[in-house]
Interface confidence: medium
């Protein structure tokens, strides 16, 4: 028997679901009788999902696999796993044995979009050319961990005195607070860019300074 | 490279029960199935029953079933079958047997190297 | 259960010879059997499995054919390693049977 899955990484955002597509080649005469069937993680071998003895053994793995049961018999042991979750990342081995067996592992990558920068300056009054300006870029509940980029009015980027720090909440979201000190010119604009890698979704913010007041 | 070690040869009676182990090294023991085959003294091959470590679910052999039973440890990668009952008809040697990672549930690449049971009053 | 038969049990033969076991399933098993050989005190050795195809790593003087119900396993130049007893298989079921076992002695 040969197992087939898809090469590239399964892309699925949190709390949606996604299918771990696995597929082999019955045999002419083949029941469902003859099917063992396994999902586990790669890594850990921790059973995910079974089908063996004719029936499916149900979810091993918080109660939110399924397989769809009408399409085995036609050769498609696909995994539905619903509600996903950042802890869901990972390799997923799909095990077949009929008379022989073989297995393929599929990635499951999971991605959440980061909210539009909100910006904060520090001071944010009484500013003056020459003065140094801390400029506080912070976007939330993303995943995986972002790159961000700063540039100025021009499009110049701005690599010096940026310090970025990712801090993962209790759902394993990230949210990002990225700090830029610059010494004020006479009018400037400072954007942020948030990018989610998985996604390759953008997320800008810019403060405007033109004296008083800010624009953001 | 699996290895399978299984426990040393035992002398039983007559109606008592054995618990013969097969620890499994070098391998991935939870997701294939380990079996238990037997040979009598100068007689064929006799397969018994296997289990899958990762299902906790084991298969028997018409003529054991209710005779025997076939558990895992995966936190220690061994297998053991128990046989009750025993007669002398069960003197023989005991494999266990596996189809290793890229075989076969059903075919044995590796083998334990043998349990002698005899049965004798 | 599927039985197996093989036959013959014994034979004798001499280095050099081309050699063939044959095994019938009680009903057709399609593809699904295998060959082992046993040494005396020894477990037994995969050599065939799904009836044709070789085990890594065994010489290819031994080959395996058939289909349904009739299977052969052939040794085109018998060595002196191969004195042995040679075995079939049936997996078609969850249930596996061996044959009773083929004897391979010097003439």
């Known amino acids: 028997v040969e197992v087939q899955v898809s090469e590239d990484p399964v892309v699925a955002l949190v709390d949606t679901d996604a299918t771990l597509r696995c597929s082999f080649s019955p045999e002419p005469g083949f029941s469902l009788a003859q099917l063992n069937l396994i999902w586990q993680l790669t890594d850990t071998k921790q059973l995910v999902h079974s089908f063996t003895e004719g029936r499916d053994q149900g979810s091993a793995y918080s109660n939110r696999t399924a397989l769809f049961p009408d399409l085995l018999v036609q050769g498609n042991a696909s995994l539905r796993l619903q509600r996903v979750r950042v802890t869901d990342e990972g390799s997923y081995t799909c095990f077949v044995s009929i008379q022989d067996f073989d297995s393929a592992a599929v990635s499951l990558q999971v991605a959440a979009p980061y909210s539009k920068p909100s910006m904060t300056l520090e001071p944010n009054k009484d500013l003056r050319p020459g003065n140094m300006v801390t400029i506080t870029c912070s976007s939330y509940q993303g995943y995986p961990e972002a790159e961000v980029f700063w540039k100025d009015g021009q499009g110049v980027p701005l690599t010096g005195n940026v310090t970025t720090s990712q801090m993962a909440n209790e759902r394993g979201l990230f949210d990002v607070h990225s700090v830029l000190r610059v010494v004020l010119g006479a009018n400037g604009t400072y954007s942020c860019l948030v990018r989610n890698p998985v996604l390759q979704q953008d997320a800008h913010g810019s403060v405007t300074i033109t004296g008083q007041p800010l624009t953001f | 490279q699996v290895q399978l070690v299984e426990s040393g040869a035992e002398v039983k009676k007559p109606g008592s029960s054995v618990k013969v182990s097969c620890k499994a090294s070098g391998g991935t023991f939870s997701s294939y199935a380990i079996s238990w085959v037997r040979q009598a003294p100068g007689q064929g091959l006799e397969w018994m029953g296997r289990?899958?470590?990762?299902?906790?679910?084991?298969n028997y052999a018409q003529k054991f079933q209710g005779r025997v039973t076939i558990t895992a440890d995966k936190s220690t990668s061994t297998a053991y079958m128990e046989l009750s009952s025993l007669r002398s008809e069960d003197t023989a040697v005991y494999y266990c047997a596996n189809g290793g990672d890229s075989s076969s549930w059903y075919t044995f690449d590796y083998w334990g190297q043998g349990t002698l049971i005899t049965v004798s009053s | 259960d599927i039985q197996m038969t093989q036959s013959p049990s014994t034979l004798s033969a001499s280095v050099g010879d081309r050699v063939n076991i044959t095994c019938r399933a009680s009903?057709?098993?399609?593809?699904?059997l295998a060959w082992y050989q046993q040494k005396p005190g020894k477990a037994p050795k995969l050599l065939i499995y799904?009836?044709?195809y070789l085990q890594t790593g065994v010489p290819s003087r031994f080959s395996g054919s058939g289909a349904g119900t009739e299977f052969t396993l052939t040794i085109s130049s018998l060595q002196p390693d191969d004195f042995a007893t040679y075995y079939c298989q049936q997996y078609n079921s969850y249930s596996l049977t061996f044959g009773g076992g083929t004897k391979v002695e010097i003439k």
């Open positions: 009903q057709t098993i399609n593809s699904w």
């Open positions: 289990i899958i470590p990762i299902l906790g679910i084991a």
């Open positions: 799904k009836a044709s």
